[in-house]
Interface confidence: medium
């Protein structure tokens, strides 16, 4: 007789990443009997919620339920009904909500309250919605990529599962770029972490890790752009801002009230004699780079060495996975290849930024103009942040790997978050190695 497939003994988990610019829902799946193995959890679905980040719903909280409906319904379809009640749902909000909380704790709580009520209406095991710290965001991103790369496994594999994977057990550093914050997390080489706020100790699968992490609030790509505009309009000769970070011929009117809405621009705020100003692109990479560098205060450092704004940063060590917006932007610019040197990236950015806006619109007709217009800034910002902010060099650039997915799972903090909350990363190495995956008898 023919072998029959047994019903799959699997588990599911859902994590919602409530970012500053949008919310994404991730569904993870793993074999129930292998929960403590490294590398067994994988992503089966990503659903991007239509609309902005949840912090933008502060004046219209009644719309949050509808906003989340499509993706939650998608989760209902993907996960078998029999599994619904034991599938945990977690929502983690990041820097967009951190900023809202800085402005008003009450408003942030109101948004989270409505999010929780909306998510409680679904047949899953809702575990809560919270604003995660920048330190958590960095740490969980680091856990995610190293888990997916198999760095926590004690078995040395003879095969490589990703092109840039080395067979040694040296962990990868994690570079995460969002809309409102950016995180850098890695294991420094025999270096004391001089600032306690930046130090994390983990024991994973029987091994100790001393990890450095920092989250730079307001230095995500969107908030960095707001900062740059607020800085530059201070010295503009009138309400026309000739901006090197936008393509020649590009024009956009900005409301001063929008510019000063975010806490990130408070340090540049001043009474301006106009309510609107117009960005006029001039498309000059070098000038754009110079303008961005003014956002990094490198003159103050109370430690042996700093990134910027007086934040301790140990010497860089090993390979780094750069994900989220680091990847999306560089992918769009076709600069994610391992073979592209830092000099080549800079050269390509110079050419790209100098291209006239009308030409760019024609070449990328399918891309939304709002996003398209900001790639020159974002690409230049990434270079500035990595080189001047984090002190990568032309040589160490080749240790940066721009990663979108690893074995089908998105690089980002959500998987690490779920692994931690479901206790799927044991402190000690599991004693026995479970049998193979076979579900046939």
């Amino acid at each position: 007789t023919q072998n029959k497939a047994l019903p799959e003994n699997v588990k599911y988990g859902i994590v919602l990443d409530a970012g500053s610019s949008h919310t994404s829902l991730y569904i993870y799946k793993w074999p129930a009997e292998k929960e403590n193995d490294t590398g067994v959890v994988h992503q089966v679905e990503e659903c991007r919620v239509k609309g902005p980040g949840i912090s933008k719903f502060v004046q219209k909280v009644n719309e949050i339920g509808i906003y989340l409906t499509d993706c939650m319904e998608r989760a209902r379809e993907v996960i078998p009904r029999s599994q619904h009640q034991e599938t945990p749902v977690y929502l983690g909000a990041t820097a967009g909500m951190r900023l809202l909380r800085m402005e008003s704790e009450e408003l942030a709580d109101r948004v989270l309250d409505v999010v929780e009520r909306s998510l409680s209406n679904y047949p899953f095991d809702f575990q809560g919605a919270r604003i995660i710290t920048g330190q958590e965001e960095g740490a969980y991103g680091w856990i995610t990529i190293n888990y997916l790369l198999g760095k926590f496994s004690q078995k040395t594999r003879w095969f490589s599962i990703v092109p840039y994977e080395t067979n040694n057990q040296e962990t990868f550093g994690a570079l995460d770029l969002g809309g409102a914050s950016t995180q850098v997390t890695f294991v420094p080489q025999n270096q004391t972490i001089e600032s306690p706020d930046n130090a994390l100790q983990f024991r994973l699968y029987g091994k100790d890790y001393n990890v450095y992490t920092h989250s730079f609030l307001c230095y995500g790509k969107d908030q960095a752009l707001w900062q740059k505009l607020a800085k530059d309009i201070q010295v503009a000769s009138n309400e026309i801002l000739r901006d090197p970070c936008f393509h020649p011929g590009y024009k956009k009117v900005v409301n001063v009230s929008d510019l000063y809405k975010t806490p990130c621009t408070k340090r540049f705020e001043m009474t301006l004699p106009f309510q609107q100003f117009e960005i006029q692109g001039i498309g000059n990479y070098q000038q754009c780079h110079q303008s961005i560098l003014e956002l990094f205060n490198t003159s103050y450092c109370p430690y042996s060495q700093c990134a910027f704004n007086g934040i301790f940063l140990p010497p860089l060590q090993g390979d780094f996975g750069a994900f989220s917006a680091f990847y999306f932007v560089m992918k769009f610019l076709n600069l994610t290849s391992e073979k592209v040197s830092q000099e080549k990236v800079t050269e390509m950015m110079k050419k790209f930024c100098a291209q006239p806006w009308e030409e760019i619109k024609t070449s990328y007709a399918g891309v939304k103009e709002k996003y398209l217009s900001e790639y020159c800034f974002s690409g230049t910002y990434i270079l500035s942040l990595l080189l001047q902010g984090y002190h990568f060099t032309a040589d160490s650039w080749e240790h940066i790997h721009f990663i979108g997915k690893i074995q089908g799972s998105d690089a980002g903090w959500t998987l690490g978050y779920m692994l931690n909350l479901t206790n799927m990363i044991p402190a000690e190495q599991p004693l026995s190695t479970p049998l193979s995956h076979s579900t046939y008898v």
Epitope: S237, N238, E239, I240, K251, T271, P273, F274, E278
Partner: antibody, heavy 119, light 107 residues
Framework: QVQLVESGGGVVQPGRSLRLSCAAS????????MHWVRQAPGKGLEWVAY????????YYADTVKGRFTISRDNSKNTLYLQMNSLRAEDTAVYYC????????????WGQGTTVTVSS | DIQMTQSPSSLSASVGDRVTITCRAS??????LNWLQQKPGKAIKRLIY???TLESGVPSRFSGSRSGSDYTLTISSLQPEDFATYYC?????????FGQGTKVEIK
Amino acid sequence: QVQLVESGGGVVQPGRSLRLSCAASGFTFSDYGMHWVRQAPGKGLEWVAYISSGSSIMYYADTVKGRFTISRDNSKNTLYLQMNSLRAEDTAVYYCARDLYYDHVLDYWGQGTTVTVSS
Amino acid sequence: DIQMTQSPSSLSASVGDRVTITCRASQEVSGYLNWLQQKPGKAIKRLIYAASTLESGVPSRFSGSRSGSDYTLTISSLQPEDFATYYCLQYASYPRTFGQGTKVEIK
């Protein structure tokens, strides 16, 4: 030297239209925002409208919003004020003035052109 | 809208007198304030900008100062050519607003 010369004023009946012009010379017109300011007989100065250097931004006083339109032609170094649905209270001397943020806000003014709205 | 309350509305003074005109802003204008001079049949002339910066070519007897939301134009020694109407103008926000004007007449 900087010169601003207004023209186009005259006597007009209520409800009718008029177009004022302001010819600029002696400076790079396309770099400057421009204003219209008026002064009713025996009264003080009242700001009317503003247009940015590239015509992307326009502001109006509530008293003229929806009736007056400010525009410019940088190739002709000329500023315009199209006034529709004129009322008796629009009777005034209309001045144009230039504006460049910080040092040059309303720093040069024209001599003015008189608009009289009367039946 | 920002209201600019200018006082006095008129004053009589003699040549050589020290004259002070004040404007009070109803909201913060952060020093974005001009002082203008108007004479019959002449173009309006800017005397002071940014509350206290003297326009080039304007005699040094004119000065501007600020104390909180009060802005002051001072003519240290009135000259015959100074008899005119003076206006303050705020340019901190739209709509731009003027004070009601101060007419300086010969005593």
